[in-house]
Interface confidence: low
């Protein structure tokens, strides 16, 4: 028997520095977790102790903090090289700055293979990107070889900016011929490494003949065997075992997100490359693991540019940006309108001639807007200003919901109106009218939504049984502020871009902003 140790990360999302337990900015260093310096300590410890070790990343290193905003992927290449990753799969967020924003900082600089079997380049891009990413890579490990085959969510064109010269194929259809090719090369130990979410990971384990292990990402799935060491609740045991259509037991793993854990999977293969046993658990990278001094020093050196950036002007406002609680928790506020407009703008993807855009709606809990911005400071808006407005380090995500769920969400928005509670919704692409004289649960008297399948966008009444795409904070997608109906009833959830980054990009693009209160949210009494 031959033993392989797979160390894996996924959805690190720009958390190069250690973070608090909830993966936001580190406040109390003695309680902080993760970060590349701490990750390196643990990886090195395992590399010294065990003979056959692979360090893999399942995508979405890009996007999530000011590190990505400033360094645009150069930081990912630099620190992944320093940690000596063996391979990485492309995630949807690797395309956030377009194909150029992937090629220049990461594909050309990475000293490790970057993989995806289901992304096919066409047109002029085909020659430009040729060889910079691969469908698979055969890696020597000790006396053996291991094949790593990559995959990426086929939803990427809706979630990021890959452009028109990359085709995202069905994962299973694309993976099978690559695995077959590896078999013809006498590679009998094959890992599928990719970024399509836990449900697809399990399908790959079931359907793709010849895949021995699946290492996934995208859904931020936490798996654990035994008592979990922190706040994350396991979605299943680690590894999660799938019985393939041809009767094999295939371990599937993921390691939550944000570099909080290092996935640790030990696989025993027989001489024919069959998995005899698999066991392990994610390792919580808490403060009991010291940060590596040399990586930490490097991080501190790179940090200097971030501090300078946060005080530079992004753009100007010529109006007061009212982010006060007494506005945003009680009525339409122009800060809410600005943020929602930025959220929609960040999700413009012209993928179908029938649709002007794939999504037109935004909802945003008023309690998530934490500060106004005064226009009398020369109108200057800085990253620092935006960090006061959006201090929680969340993301703006894409969900699919039925109209009936949206109606429940808007009823919840005003079910205890007047108490300055955070659930009051700010909106974009939605016109809502409330009648507060009616009993809670029956206060939404009009709810119109902006069409997407139209050349001239206009507002139509919400249809209860129709499925709509909505951009919202991850806090709401996870049921925060009492929006349990969103969490329970959502049909799809894809994590998006860092909230501050979305708004800062929009302001930089617009240069001068003047959001108004324009009647998106109205109140009526009696008949309207």
């Amino acid at each position: 028997a031959w033993e392989l140790t797979i160390l894996h990360t996924n959805d690190v999302h720009s958390r190069l520095e250690q973070t608090s337990e909830d993966s936001s900015k580190c406040v109390n260093a003695s309680r902080c977790m993760g970060g590349v310096a701490r990750l390196f300590t643990k990886v090195q410890q395992i590399r010294r102790a065990e003979p056959n070790v692979l360090l893999l990343d399942a995508g979405d290193q890009y996007q999530g903090t000011i590190w990505f905003t400033v360094y645009k992927g150069a930081e990912v290449a630099h620190f992944m090289n320093a940690l000596r990753y063996d391979a990485m799969a492309l995630g949807n967020h690797e395309f956030d700055n377009g194909v150029e924003g992937l090629i220049e900082p990461l594909l050309k600089e990475a000293k490790f293979p970057i993989l995806s079997a289901n992304i096919k380049a066409k047109g002029p891009l085909a020659s430009q990107i040729s060889g910079l990413y691969l469908p698979y890579k055969v890696l020597p490990v000790g006396d053996e070889v291991v094949g790593i085959v990559g995959y990426t969510s086929k939803e990427t064109p809706f979630l990021s900016n890959p452009g028109t010269n990359l085709v995202f194929e069905d994962e299973i259809t694309a993976l099978q011929p690559e695995v077959d090719k590896l078999k013809t090369l006498n590679v009998n130990k094959i890992i599928a490494l990719g970024h399509s979410g836990f449900e697809m990971d399990k399908l790959i384990a079931q359907k793709v003949r010849g895949v021995d292990v699946v290492v996934g990402g995208h859904s931020n799935t936490f798996l654990y065997t035994g008592n979990p060491p922190s706040k994350e609740v396991p979605a299943g045991k680690y590894p999660f075992i799938v019985t393939s259509d041809d009767g094999r037991k295939v371990p599937v793993v993921q390691a939550y997100a944000f570099g909080k854990y290092l996935g640790y999977l030990k696989i025993e293969f027989d001489e024919r490359g069959n998995v005899i046993s698999s066991h392990g658990n994610p390792i919580l990278l808490n403060s009991s693991i010291p940060e590596d001094p040399s990586i930490k020093a490097d991080i501190n050196k790179w940090r200097i540019k971030l501090d300078n950036y946060s005080t530079q002007e992004l753009g100007k406002t010529i109006v007061y940006l009212d982010g006060s609680s007494q506005s945003c928790r009680f009525r339409e506020c122009n800060m809410g309108n600005l943020i929602c407009d930025a959220m929609i703008n960040n999700n413009l993807r012209h993928t179908d001639e029938m649709f002007w855009n794939h999504v037109s709606m935004c909802i945003l809990n008023g309690g998530g807007i934490r500060s106004p911005i005064d226009e009398r400071n020369n109108g200057t808006i800085t990253w620092e200003n935006l960090a006061a407005v959006l201090p929680f380090g969340g993301t703006f995500d894409l969900v699919q919901l039925k109209g009936s769920t949206l109606k429940k969400a808007f009823e919840h928005s005003v079910h205890r109106y007047g108490q300055s509670t955070g659930e009051f919704l700010q909106v974009g692409g939605i016109h809502v009218v409330y009648d507060l004289s009616r009993k809670p649960g029956d206060r939404v008297v009009k709810l119109d939504v902006l069409c997407t399948k139209c050349r001239v966008p206009s507002y139509d009444p919400l249809k209860m049984d129709e499925v709509y795409k909505v951009i919202l904070p991850n806090f709401l997608a996870n049921g925060g502020d009492g929006f349990q109906m969103i969490k329970d009833e959502l049909l799809r959830h894809d994590s998006g871009d860092q909230d501050i980054n979305v708004v800062s990009t929009y302001i930089s693009k617009m240069k001068v902003i003047y959001p108004a209160v324009e009647g998106r949210i109205k109140f009526s009494t009696g008949s309207h």
Partner: antibody, heavy 119, light 106 residues
């Protein structure tokens, strides 16, 4: 329902360190948006905000007293602890802990504990 | 820091009177102001937040108004239980309180 209770010494000597504990129930400091603050009131005088801790361990202090104050929390025990160094007779006051709403007004208060600084 | 100057510092009135207490902030605090009532030996109780919003359970005779730097707490018809000390508080920057207004029976 929400309750808060302050505990600590009734008498401290000048230059000593005061440690006060706020034990609360009816809410959890691990819930997003929750916070607990400390406010004091010298006899017959106005209220003065001292410090505040959020659910995510973010801490804020009154700038004029910052060097003397430390606030911490033990989420599992539902407690928040305030320490104040180098006590002086002018620090004689009733010390209150209060739950801070998502912005910074205080809806729920403890009954207060009178601390006298005297040799 | 932001000073909150309350006036008057004391006030005598009778049951049924309309009473107004004012608070002036040393700089613009928008509507980030709360009002509290405190009785001897007791903790303060919030009456008004965000300058004009009555906290749940507070009688409708209490109302607040103002924005920017000038704020008012009004008791439309004094009741016996209203005789107490009233404090304003701003929370636009770190919280600061007014020095209090003692409302006594005439």
């Amino acid at each position: 329902q929400v309750t808060l209770r302050e505990s600590g010494p009734a008498l401290v000597k000048p230059t000593q360190t005061l440690t006060l504990t706020c034990t609360f129930s009816g809410f959890s400091l691990s819930t997003s948006g929750m916070g607990v603050g400390w406010i004091r009131q010298p006899p017959g005088k106005a209220l003065e905000w001292l410090a505040h801790i959020w659910w995510d361990d973010d801490k804020y202090y009154n700038p004029s007293l910052k060097s003397r104050l430390t606030i911490s929390k033990d989420t599992s025990k539902n407690q928040v602890v305030l320490t104040m160094t180098n006590m002086d007779p002018v620090d004689t006051a009733t010390y209150y802990c209060a739950r801070r709403e998502r912005w910074a007004w205080f809806a729920y208060w403890g009954q207060g504990t009178l601390v006298t600084v005297s040799s | 820091d932001i000073q909150m100057t309350q006036s008057p510092s004391s006030l005598s009135a009778s049951v049924g009177d309309r009473v107004t207490i004012t608070c002036r902030a040393s700089q613009n605090v928008f509507t980030n102001v709360a009002w509290y009532q405190q009785k001897p030996g007791k903790a303060p109780k919030v009456l008004i937040y965000s300058a004009s919003y009555r906290y749940s359970g507070v009688p409708s005779r209490f109302s607040g108004s103002g924005s920017g730097t000038d704020f008012t707490l009004t008791i439309s018809s004094l009741q016996p239980e209203d005789f107490a000390t009233y404090f304003c508080q701003q929370y636009n920057s770190y919280p600061t309180f007014g020095q209090g207004t003692k409302l006594e029976i005439k």
